[in-house]
Interface confidence: medium
Amino acid sequence: SGTTNTVAAYNLTWKSTNFKTILEWEPKPINQVYTVQISTKSGDWKSKCFYTADTECDLTDEIVKDVKQTYLARVFSYPAGHVESTGSTEEPPYENSPEFTPYLETNLGQPTIQSFEQVGTKVNVTVQDEWTLVRRNDTFLSLRDVFGKDLIYTLYYWKSSSSGKKTAKTNTNEFLIDVDKGENYCFSVQAVIPSRRTANRKSTDSPVECMGHEKGESRETGHHHHHH
């Protein structure tokens, strides 16, 4: 059954990065609008994005309540201009989304190198901790707060004058690496959740930062912080 002249949504897809989570679907509406509902496996349905002509709905506020829960969403289709009609006993057509568990499935956003400092033949590289919309006790949590030891960072570094890359790993947000004196190095980092088996186990690489440029200059005397 379905409401006259409305078609059910299809291709429901979760798009989620660092827990910012949007449900997308098709088709672009012609003479119809949509309402989205979201629920946990054992919870009640909660309606969002009432009678929207968009084909996406930001569900972040709901999923951040518990990122380890498994969520299901559904999209209802209504005829445009008749959404308040009470005469019809027909249930509007709807489509269910795939299940979505944010902790397991949210993509890792592109990380940023916050700073690096050189002391002699060692360089300390710090990765900026990304803030999420996940809260605990009214405080927003960082990616590290949420994932803890499940999250590591991989550092790629190479001499500016060559292309041979080296790697280092950390389960904090800091690297301490050995470098050759008098050489400039370039750095890029990647966030990784090694125990994910799927394509979303790694972020894209951060922008490359090189010594001797704006974010850092190679100094062999004393500490030199580069923040922005």
Epitope: K41, K68, K149, D150, P194
Partner: antibody
Amino acid sequence: EVQLQQSGPELVKPGASLKISCKASGYSFTGYYMNWVKQSPEKSLEWIGEINPSTGGSTYNQKFKAKATLTVDQSSNTAYMQLKSLTSEDSAVYYCARRELGGPFGYWGQGTPVTVSA
Amino acid sequence: SIVMTQTPKFLLVSSGDRVTITCKASQSVSNGIAWYQQKPGQSPKLLIYFASNRYTGVPDRFTGSGYGTDFTFTISTVQAEDLAVYFCQQDYSSPWTFGGGTKLEIK
């Protein structure tokens, strides 16, 4: 296929030490924390601690901090647990277990029975 | 440490019965609960994680539910091969702790 192959049964005297091994295969050894769990009839299952094979960093249950030492050998994809100053209360089956994303133990070794007896 | 109180300790059931095991945490563990099955002479096997998610390859007669401090594990239609001890475990706060186990026996 993921496999955790543990060393065989041990019969040791009180006061002695022993080292149990757990050889991992079928997955990236450095990508998952390795945990150790004690099973005894009296106390059911007790978590001993875990080690990050990538860094060698370990976390212990306070109860076992003086009893167990966790190490890894990346070259052989093997995790080890050393138990010292053994007493009859340490008689149990000891399991290694791979921690999955978010906390649960998805794969377990077959267990190493340890008997402490004079 | 968070204490996990699991009940009952023993269950004697017939094939085809519905079975429910409960686990109560001494403080909220959100949905950080896993359930394991240990058959005689074998290692524990993960069945349920995040309180309600079935692990890979686990039959759908095994289900989990609950949030906070009270959790339930259900076998909808017990089969002879379900003879085992079942454990709950909280993976919310270290040290990870287990329930005392429920021994399921088939009449």
